[in-house]
């Protein structure tokens, strides 16, 4: 089980002559919805047939009138995801329709009126649990650039979530037989659920509720050894009774690989080893073609004429990978300036300016001095983008409107008393010590260590600090 | 239109040197970053040098100490020194630039590419 989403990023004009009219007016404004219909495999996009993988149906986007005289821009488009469940396993190919549909808010008799705009449908190959494909497809004049991908809802995971994770119980490793669930290394791929008391050890099951036994064992929960003496067959399903093999059915027999793949035992199964063109648990899914337009972002493909043959895509500058689906990290090359983060959004870069940054680039400086004023005789300083008032004595704050308090601070030592001042603060110091803070002791015989009191100013009387 | 030009691939023997320039020309206002970027048959495309947007200068460390990039702004060129060369070099190279156009929107373009290839 899983789900596909659909981000449609665009909704206008295509390139080249021939603008399309713009689908809302002032007389009529209106706004659009998405309509997306998925198939498995590579089937006929006929808009008639059932959408067996899923449908979905977005949100109405935001009213849009036309500005008159104005060419028809990029359509306003609704919030979020197209959202489409699946509930078996993802088919690897698959094809789809995404409508454009305009619905009209004008004084229609009976409601807002409908009506389609673009239709645009295509066939293409896709993992679960891969990024997200980024597509730009033309119907008429108008364009439609949009990104997909299919994800497993846990405990799904694999390319087709079919396999299942749970959280690992012991922190180094999986149990046995367990592997580690790629790419969740911390998750191990989660048993199916048995039959209730199906043995853990000699019992196993491909579909839930069934409980197959390993070789060795027999019996409605596989808790029966196989006494082998009495017996000729050396393998198969047993009878709970006699605790003998007998032939039965292996996971081979009848061959469950379609498209002439050959199938091997699995201790716990079977694998299907399938021709070329073909791929899927049991080579169920048919290969892709040229044809399929399996090259993404503009790639061209080459070879790939019939199913037998590969297609090799050749990508675009900026893209790559096998279907040309992943855009070349364009922000390793580091185009914002100041420290400004870079994002790849696809369609452009952008760039996250830090403080005091902006531009496109983050190539300007903001002035943050510019129109802030400091008060009480402040000058601004400049720095890192946050601007800072130097405030004139007596005043402090972010922008100096506060009246600082001088004796705060507790300049005066020495047990020395702090009075505010209008220029500044005075100590009156203890007796014993003299100095504009009180940081010189006074000797016994009337001289100071350092500088003397200046005249006419006895050591205990207050000093005004400047 | 902005086009970016690359010349100066070729074929050359392990310890062998290429420079490589990249002429970029059209509605450009200003370069921003510029480098260049490699792609191995079946490999991932990757940054081998560029100048930043803050004119820094990065390199990949597979190429620190054996390739150099430089520019000429009059020219709007860029150019990559590659000395030392080895099998692994082997690639088509390709120019990249962040340009400010005039209408002062920024564009990210590529250039077609140039092959290197290092074999005895």
């Known amino acids: 089980a899983g789900v596909f989403e659909l981000q449609i990023h665009s909704f206008g004009p295509g390139p080249g002559p021939g603008a399309p009219r713009s689908p809302c007016s002032a007389r009529l404004p209106c706004r659009l919805f998405f309509r997306v219909c998925l198939k498995p495999g590579l089937s006929e996009e006929a808009a008639e047939s059932p959408c067996a993988l899923g449908a979905a149906l977005s949100a109405r986007g935001p009213v849009y009138t036309e500005q008159p005289g104005a060419p028809a821009p990029d359509l306003p488009l609704p919030d979020g995801l197209l959202q489409v469940p699946f509930r078996d396993a993802w088919p690897g190919t698959f094809s789809f329709i995404i409508e454009t549909w305009r619905e009209e808010l004008g004084d229609q008799i009976g409601g807002p009126a409908w009506s389609l705009l673009a239709r645009v449908a295509g066939r293409r190959r896709l993992a679960a649990g891969g990024p997200w494909a980024r597509d730009i497809q033309r119907a008429g004049a108008w364009e439609l650039r949009f990104s997909y991908r299919a994800r497993c809802e846990p405990p799904a995971v694999g390319t087709a979530c079919t396999r299942l994770c749970r959280p690992r119980s012991a922190p180094s490793r999986c149990g046995p037989g367990l592997r580690p669930c790629a790419p969740l290394e911390d998750e191990c791929e989660a048993p199916l659920v048995c039959r209730a008391g199906c043995s853990p050890e000699h019992g196993f099951c491909e579909q839930p509720g069934e409980c197959r036994c390993l070789e060795g064992w027999t019996g409605p929960l596989c808790t029966v050894p196989v006494s082998t003496s009495s017996c000729l067959s050396p393998r198969g399903p047993s009878s709970a009774t006699t605790g003998c093999l007998v032939p039965g059915p292996g996971p081979c027999d009848g061959n469950p690989c379609a498209n002439g793949g050959s199938c091997s035992e699995t201790p716990r199964s079977f694998e299907c080893t399938c021709p070329r063109g073909f791929y899927g648990l049991r080579c169920e899914v048919s290969g892709v073609t040229c044809a399929d337009g399996p090259c993404f972002n503009g790639g061209l493909c080459v070879g790939g004429a019939d199913p037998d043959s590969a297609y090799i895509c050749h990508c675009p500058p900026g893209f790559q990978g096998s279907n040309c689906e992943k855009r070349v990290d364009r922000c390793s090359l580091q185009p914002c300036r100041n420290g400004g983060l870079c994002l790849d959004l696809g369609h452009a870069l952008r760039c996250r300016c830090r403080a005091g940054f902006a531009g496109p680039r983050c190539e300007h400086d903001l002035d943050d001095c510019a129109g802030r004023a400091c008060a009480n005789g402040g000058t601004c300083v400049e720095g890192g983008g946050a601007h800072r008032c130097s405030c004139a004595l007596g005043f402090g704050g972010r922008d100096c409107r506060e009246r600082a308090d001088p004796c705060a601070a507790r300049p005066c030592a020495h047990g020395g008393r702090c009075y505010a001042h209008f220029s500044g603060l005075v100590c009156a110091c203890a007796p014993g010590y003299m100095g504009a803070r009180c940081e010189f002791p006074v000797h016994p015989d009337g001289a100071s260590a350092l500088p003397a009191a200046p005249p006419g100013l006895r050591p205990g009387d207050p000093q005004r600090y400047l | 239109e902005v086009q970016l030009v690359e010349s100066g691939g070729g074929e050359v023997q392990p310890g062998g040197s290429l420079r490589l320039s990249c002429a970029a020309s059209?509605?450009?206002?200003?370069?921003?970053?510029m480098g260049w970027y490699r792609q191995a048959p079946g490999k991932q495309r990757e940054l081998v040098a560029g100048f930043t947007g803050d004119t820094n200068t990065i390199y990949a460390e597979s190429v620190k100490g054996r390739f150099t990039i430089s520019r000429d702004n009059a020219k709007n060129t860029v150019y990559l020194q590659m000395s030392s060369l080895r099998a692994e070099d082997t690639a088509v190279y390709y120019c990249?630039?962040?340009?400010?156009?005039?209408?002062?929107?920024?564009?990210?373009?590529w250039g077609q590419g140039t092959l290197v290839t290092v074999k005895p």
């Open positions: 059209g509605s450009i206002f200003s370069s921003n970053a």
């Open positions: 990249a630039a962040d340009v400010q156009l005039f209408s002062r929107d920024y564009e990210f373009y």
